[in-house]
Interface confidence: medium
């Protein structure tokens, strides 16, 4: 409960906000959840707490884990959890689903793409913007404050947009990138019974005990903007929110991508520190629209190590 997913790339800055709301004057204590060890507030540390914010300057893959914040007001103590995953830099241009922020839709009249999480950082304009890893050039693109505006939006403008900026902390600069999909609303759309692209039905995924793993639920629903199109994970037939295990989280927001003109939605189930009992669970990817519901099941199994003599 009160757990928020945050992710970033190694060697970039990552700033995470405690998911409990309160006043800036409240005292906030941060801990490593596993060890209950307090996180220092001194800025000379690479990872330090600063009120409601937890700062990784820069982040390392080993920082991944669950962090506890306790917000102490004069009347209550409130506990929250930040589930942090730091990934290795991708060697190629492809941005995997688990690094994507929520999708935004645009039309000819409104084509603003906000840079996700930027409000947490101390940055100065201008932002750099990339589409499918190519720097955006031309008068159609205007970087304005924390968002990008595209003039005369066309269907070709759909794709993955990355903003890049510099966070400054006490004179030191750290790079930050964030990517989200942009979809263009198409008037001539239609909807179909959901088609689940991943996982395959009754698939089994091999995992290492103690490692993190991600399961992607991806389905297509038709062409163009969809009135209702949702994908979600269930555990043993129960909603993720009813399953009180902070290690297992469904990402906030759903990424919408267009594959061959089809409207497809993804959501990632993140499982931190895989345990034996996770192998006993049934993981259901549910895709729902006005036509109905489709379900694909996936199970986890322990990775077999082949010993060579």
């Amino acid at each position: 409960k009160f757990s928020k997913q945050s992710w970033g790339l190694e060697n970039e800055a990552l700033i995470v906000r405690c998911p409990r709301q309160g006043k800036s004057s409240y005292i906030v204590d941060w801990y490593y959840s596993q060890t209950n060890k307090s996180i220092p507030t001194q800025e000379r540390n690479r990872v330090f707490a600063s009120g409601q914010l937890l700062k990784f300057l820069p982040a390392e893959v080993a920082d991944s884990g669950i962090y506890t914040c306790i917000v102490r007001s004069p009347t209550f103590n409130r506990t929250g959890y930040a589930n942090v995953t730091i990934y290795k830099k991708q060697p190629d241009c492809n941005v995997p689903d688990y690094l994507m922020y929520s999708t935004v839709s645009g039309s000819e009249k409104n084509s603003k793409i906000y840079c996700p999480t930027i409000d947490l950082y101390n940055w100065t304009a201008p932002l750099e913007w990339f589409k499918n890893c190519q720097a955006l050039q031309g008068s159609r693109y205007k970087a304005h404050k924390s968002f990008l505006v595209i003039d005369n939006v066309m269907t070709d403008d759909a794709g993955d947009y990355t903003c890049k900026f510099i966070h400054n902390e006490n004179g030191a600069n750290y790079s930050v990138t964030a990517t989200r999909s942009f979809t263009v609303k198409d008037e001539q759309g239609f909807s179909l019974f959901p088609v689940i692209r991943a996982p395959a039905h009754n698939e089994t995924k091999e995992v290492e005990i103690g490692e993190n793993t991600n399961l992607t639920c991806s389905a297509c629903f038709g062409k163009g903007a969809q009135f209702l199109a949702t994908v979600q994970w269930q555990l043993n037939g129960n909603k993720i929110t009813d399953f009180s295990e902070p290690r297992i989280q469904q990402e906030e927001g759903q990424n919408q991508s267009f594959s061959n003109g089809l409207a497809c939605v993804n959501t990632v189930l993140r499982i931190a520190d895989v345990k034996e009992e996770d192998l006993l669970l049934r993981y259901d990817c549910l895709a729902l629209n006005l036509h109905g519901l489709r379900r694909h099941t996936i199970r986890l199994s322990r990775k077999h190590h082949h010993h060579h003599h």
Partner: antibody
Framework: EVQLVQSGAEVKKPGATVKISCKVS????????MHWVQQAPGKGLEWMGR????????EYAEKFQGRVTITADTSTDTAYMELSSLRSEDTAVYYC??????????WGQGTLVTVSS | DIQMTQSPSSLSASVGDRVTITCITN??????IHWYQQKPGKVPKLLIY???TLRPGVPSRFSGSGSGTDFTLTISSLQPEDVATYYC????????FGQGTKLEIK
């Protein structure tokens, strides 16, 4: 001991405006949120809104939006709730209560407002 | 807006009885549910916050449970001084009180 002392009962005519005060003692009003709650005679509790007195940020329940104004004077540790365009159904006891963003911990004694022509 | 359905609206029980009051929300909320007691002619008093955390000074016969959309306040052994109206409050999105449950002694 935290204490919240509210102003006295009021009788108002329909269409008028009422302003209730809530003075906090043994507590700095800036340190937490101040909420206001309505309770009509024989009825349940209804949250009206809250203020962060340190910065003046307010949020109001949809039902009262446009008619209620919550303010705070940090120099006197006093919060105020003003309700305009009064009608007979606004006859109620109004409570101030201090707490965090999510809930109320300490309550004032209540102020009865009677709206009658 | 989040709607709260509190039940029952009133109930009568004997001293020593186990009493449960339920609040159901129309949407999944985190455990941002709190329980208040209001004795006749008195101001409301916070009993339980965040689903199941007892406020200091509140007798241990009071407990809270539930998650998602269904929440329960339980009085394990009803005492005469528990005669009051009980309200749940959600604060997942703004704040909304339940309609209240008036508890009387048989």
């Amino acid at each position: 001991e935290v204490q919240l002392v509210q102003s006295g009962a009021e009788v108002k005519k329909p269409g008028a405006t009422v302003k209730i005060s809530c003075k906090v003692s043994a507590f700095n009003i800036k340190d937490d949120y101040m909420h206001w709650v309505q309770q009509a005679p024989g009825k349940g509790l209804e949250w009206m809104g809250r203020i962060d007195p340190a910065i003046g940020n307010t949020e109001y329940a949809e039902k009262f939006q446009g008619r209620v104004t919550i303010t705070a004077d940090t120099s006197t540790d006093t919060a105020y709730m003003e309700l305009s365009s009064l009608r007979s159904e606004d006859t109620a006891v109004y409570y101030c209560a201090t707490g965090d963003f999510y809930a109320m911990a300490y309550w004032g004694q209540g102020t009865l407002v009677t709206v009658s022509s | 807006d989040i709607q709260m359905t509190q039940s029952p609206s009133s109930l009568s029980a004997s001293v020593g009885d186990r009493v449960t009051i339920t609040c159901i929300t129309n949407t999944d909320i985190d455990d941002v549910i709190h329980w208040y007691q209001q004795k006749p002619g008195k101001v409301p008093k916070l009993l339980i916050y965040e689903g199941n955390t007892l406020r200091p000074g509140v007798p241990s016969r009071f407990s809270g449970s539930g998650s998602g959309t269904d929440f329960t306040l339980t009085i394990s052994s009803l005492q005469p001084e528990d005669v009051a109206t009980y309200y749940c409050l959600q604060s997942d999105n703004m704040l909304t009180f339940g309609q209240g449950t008036k508890l009387e002694i048989k």
